[in-house]
């Protein structure tokens, strides 16, 4: 099989400050090196990029400084963290996965984790 | 509107060389890899090469390889392939393509026709 | 590389009537394949993606199924402009193929 499967969880809720993490593993058909992890928002039919990053196996996952994301790998598995969220930001978020170098290429992409993020409520106003 | 507009193309002798380019507008073009597709008259797709979002990571197919050279300038929103070393075989029309996020071909040029004849 | 295998080379059919496509793949491509459509002095347009969904503007006419070596393109019912070529594509792994296409004509 030539293909390149991702796997991911269905669902995630993040927590009260806006913060959601999940793991997304990919199971590899070549020996790659440089490897680009990319997560895509789908809402209705559109898809839009939120962040990406490049990374050699077995160096850290550096996104760009003003990314929502962060993130840690290790082998075929990278831990991602999305942060800033707010309620309108519930929807779909897909793992893509890119094996860059060296040739072939390879593409895969997730189904997607549903990530719900609920506004905490303002705390109420105190006499004392 | 989303567009893709080719140009470059003509007549060139066998051994010849040909730059075509491909102006992208209505969408962040550094944002994107682009491909170059051709196809020879009457004949079906053919994948030529692809080059990442920053240029760091580029690809040819077996039957290009050291003859053709993409590039791109994500300042001028612009496309380029260096063709050396042309032969009659290379005789097609050249479309350029945005490499979708989902992975697809999702936008394509109305293509530029590439002669290679003596 | 990856081959893909177009049948049938044409179909002649009449506007209203259903149109199958197949696209099969030399080994699995999972669901990292396309369809496009491609009318003569044209460029190709995506019409399908993923192998079943509809990439944005397509009518729902046009629906994509399969996974793995076998992949259907259906038009349920054929309009005017439908009457075209119709080429697979698999995006997973370089090089990226192409099925050699299927001419669907007006009967």
């Known amino acids: 099989c030539k293909a390149m499967h991702v796997a991911q969880p269905a669902v995630v809720l993040a927590s009260s400050r806006g913060i959601a993490s999940f793991v997304c593993e990919y199971a590899s058909p070549g020996k790659a090196t440089e490897v680009r992890v990319t997560v895509l928002r789908q809402a209705d039919s559109q898809v839009t990029e939120v962040c990406a990053a490049t990374y050699m196996m077995g160096n850290e996952l550096t996104f760009l400084d003003d990314s929502i994301c962060t993130g840690t790998s290790s082998g075929n598995q990278v831990n991602l963290t999305i942060q800033g969220l707010r309620a309108m930001d519930t929807g779909l978020y897909i793992c893509k996965v890119e094996l860059m170098y060296p040739p072939p290429y390879y593409l895969g992409i997730g189904n997607g984790t549903q990530i719900y993020v609920i506004d905490p409520e303002p705390c109420p106003d105190s006499d004392f | 509107e989303v567009q893709l507009l080719e140009s470059g193309g003509g007549l060139v002798q066998p051994g010849g060389s040909l730059r075509l380019s491909c102006a992208a507008s209505?969408?962040?073009?550094?944002?994107?890899?682009m491909s170059w597709v051709r196809q020879a008259p009457g004949k079906g797709l053919v994948w030529v090469s692809s080059?990442?979002?920053?240029?760091?990571?580029?690809y040819y197919a077996d039957s290009v390889k050291g003859r053709f050279t993409i590039s791109r300038d994500n300042a001028k929103n612009s496309l380029y392939l260096q063709m050396n070393s042309l032969r009659a075989e290379d005789t097609a029309v050249y479309y350029c393509?945005?490499?979708?996020?989902?992975?697809?071909?999702?936008?394509w040029g109305q293509g530029t026709m590439v002669t290679v004849s003596s | 590389e990856i081959v893909l295998t177009q049948s049938p080379g044409t179909l002649s059919l009449s506007p209203g009537e259903r149109a199958t496509l197949s696209c099969r793949a030399s080994q699995s491509v999972s669901r990292y394949l396309g369809w496009y459509q491609q009318k003569p002095g044209q460029a190709p347009r995506l019409l399908i993606y993923g192998a079943s969904t509809r990439a944005t503007g397509i009518p729902d006419r046009f629906s994509g199924s399969g996974s793995g070596t076998d992949f259907t393109l259906t038009i349920t019912r054929l309009e005017p402009e439908d009457f075209a070529v119709y080429y697979c594509q698999q995006y997973g792994s370089s090089p990226w193929t192409f099925g050699q296409g299927t001419k669907v004509e007006i009967k």
């Open positions: 080059i990442s979002s920053s240029s760091s990571y580029i």
């Open positions: 393509a945005r490499v979708g996020l989902m992975g697809p071909f999702d936008i």
């Open positions: 209505g969408f962040t073009f550094s944002s994107y890899a």
